[in-house]
Interface confidence: low
């Protein structure tokens, strides 16, 4: 199985600057009936959800069992990236990005990331 | 099959630029990103960076900020690493190497390799 | 100073097992992220060898292995032949440079 994985380098700031940016986070092993709204919903508990997004299959339409989110403050990512989190009845994992651009994304997107997707993930 | 050729060795002054070219063939150039490795005389491999492919956006690691710059020419399938005011310690052979990752791997390899463009700097 | 460690040489006899240790820390090897393998010829470029810690490209013999354990990896070559003499070099990703890094290579001598 090779999936569209990478996710841009918002990262943090440069070394020496005083603020650290928020960056995009994925989130793994979302159960195939979480939608956006669902998504909001559960990380709001934690913070101020800027952006949420659930990756769909181009052709069908359905959930690719992964998504983003985006939290405005840092520490509200910290707090997040440090445990697992029940969505849906699943165990989810949210990780930081760590790679390059998509193998297989369309032109138009500009979504990056990399992470561990379910065994039945299909493209 | 698969394969990234450079352009040919180059003998430079100092002060001077110099433009590396990068062919890819094979496989869609636009599908992947692609990444810049220093290797000093007898020395080992050094990350510079990568470019989106897609985007044409470029990501230099820490120390190759200012005069190096990553560069595409989608309709021929062609990555560019440029260097400006050349000194004696850039003399290294320069390689791109395309970036390749799957779903269930945390972070991306390179592979294929270019073959290597030898620039030398001196006066 | 590379960001990832690994000996400058290791040495064998043909028919030998040698093994290549590469060591991280918690914002690379250790932070999950997976360490792959290229093998240098001399005079030649890079050719990935082991990808996401034991993954072998095709074409690549299985004499060659690659295991990871918490903060390091290693790649271990059973059967040593006269023309796996090469520098090898390990490859992560560091999350505190947010940047692939390299080990600084090792010279492997088949005696």
């Known amino acids: 199985m090779r999936g569209s994985h990478h996710h841009h380098h918002h990262g943090l700031v440069p070394r020496g600057s005083a603020v650290q940016k928020t960056s995009d986070l994925i989130v793994l092993g979302l159960p195939w009936k979480t939608t956006e709204q669902d998504l909001k919903e559960y990380f709001s508990t934690f913070g101020e959800v800027l952006m949420v997004q659930v990756k769909k299959d181009l052709k069908t339409g359905h959930s690719k069992g992964f998504g983003f989110v985006r939290f405005t403050e840092y520490e509200t990512q910290v707090k997040v990236m440090s445990q697992r989190h029940m969505i849906d009845g699943r165990w989810c994992d949210c990780k930081l990005p760590n790679s390059k651009q998509s193998q297989d994304e369309p032109l138009r997107s500009r979504k990056v990331f990399v992470g561990r997707c379910t065994e039945d993930m299909t493209e | 099959q698969v394969q990234l050729v450079q352009s040919g060795s180059e003998l430079k002054k100092p002060g001077a630029s110099v433009k590396v070219s990068c062919k890819a063939s094979?496989?869609?150039?636009?599908?992947?990103?692609m990444n810049w490795v220093r290797q000093a005389p007898g020395q080992g491999l050094e990350w510079m960076g990568w470019?989106?492919?897609?985007?044409?956006?470029?990501t230099y690691a820490q120390g190759f900020t200012g005069r190096f710059v990553f560069s595409l020419d989608t309709s021929v399938s062609t990555a560019y690493l440029q260097i400006s005011s050349l000194k004696a310690e850039d003399t290294a052979v320069y390689y791109c190497?395309?970036?390749?990752?799957?779903?269930?791997?945390?972070?991306?390899?390179?592979?294929?390799w270019g073959q290597g463009t030898l620039v030398t700097v001196s006066s | 100073q590379s960001v990832l460690t690994q000996p400058p040489s290791v040495s064998g006899a043909p028919g030998q097992r040698v093994t290549i240790s590469c060591t991280g820390s918690?914002?690379?090897?250790?932070?999950?992220?997976?360490v792959h393998w290229y093998q240098q010829l001399p005079g030649t470029a890079p050719k990935l060898l082991i990808y996401?810690?034991?993954n072998r490209p095709s074409g690549v013999p299985d004499r060659f292995s690659g295991s990871k354990s918490g903060t390091s990896a290693s790649l271990a070559i059973t059967g040593l032949q006269a023309e796996d003499e090469a520098d090898y070099y390990c490859?992560?990703?560091?999350?505190?440079?947010?940047?692939?890094?390299f080990g600084g290579g090792t010279k492997l001598t088949v005696l």
């Open positions: 996401g810690n034991s």
């Open positions: 490859q992560s990703f560091d999350s505190s440079l947010s940047s692939s890094v």
């Open positions: 470019i989106n492919t897609n985007t044409g956006n470029p």
């Open positions: 190497a395309r970036d390749r990752i799957d779903g269930s791997s945390w972070s991306s390899w390179f592979d294929p």
């Open positions: 918690s914002s690379n090897i250790g932070a999950g992220y997976d």
């Open positions: 094979g496989y869609t150039f636009t599908s992947y990103a």
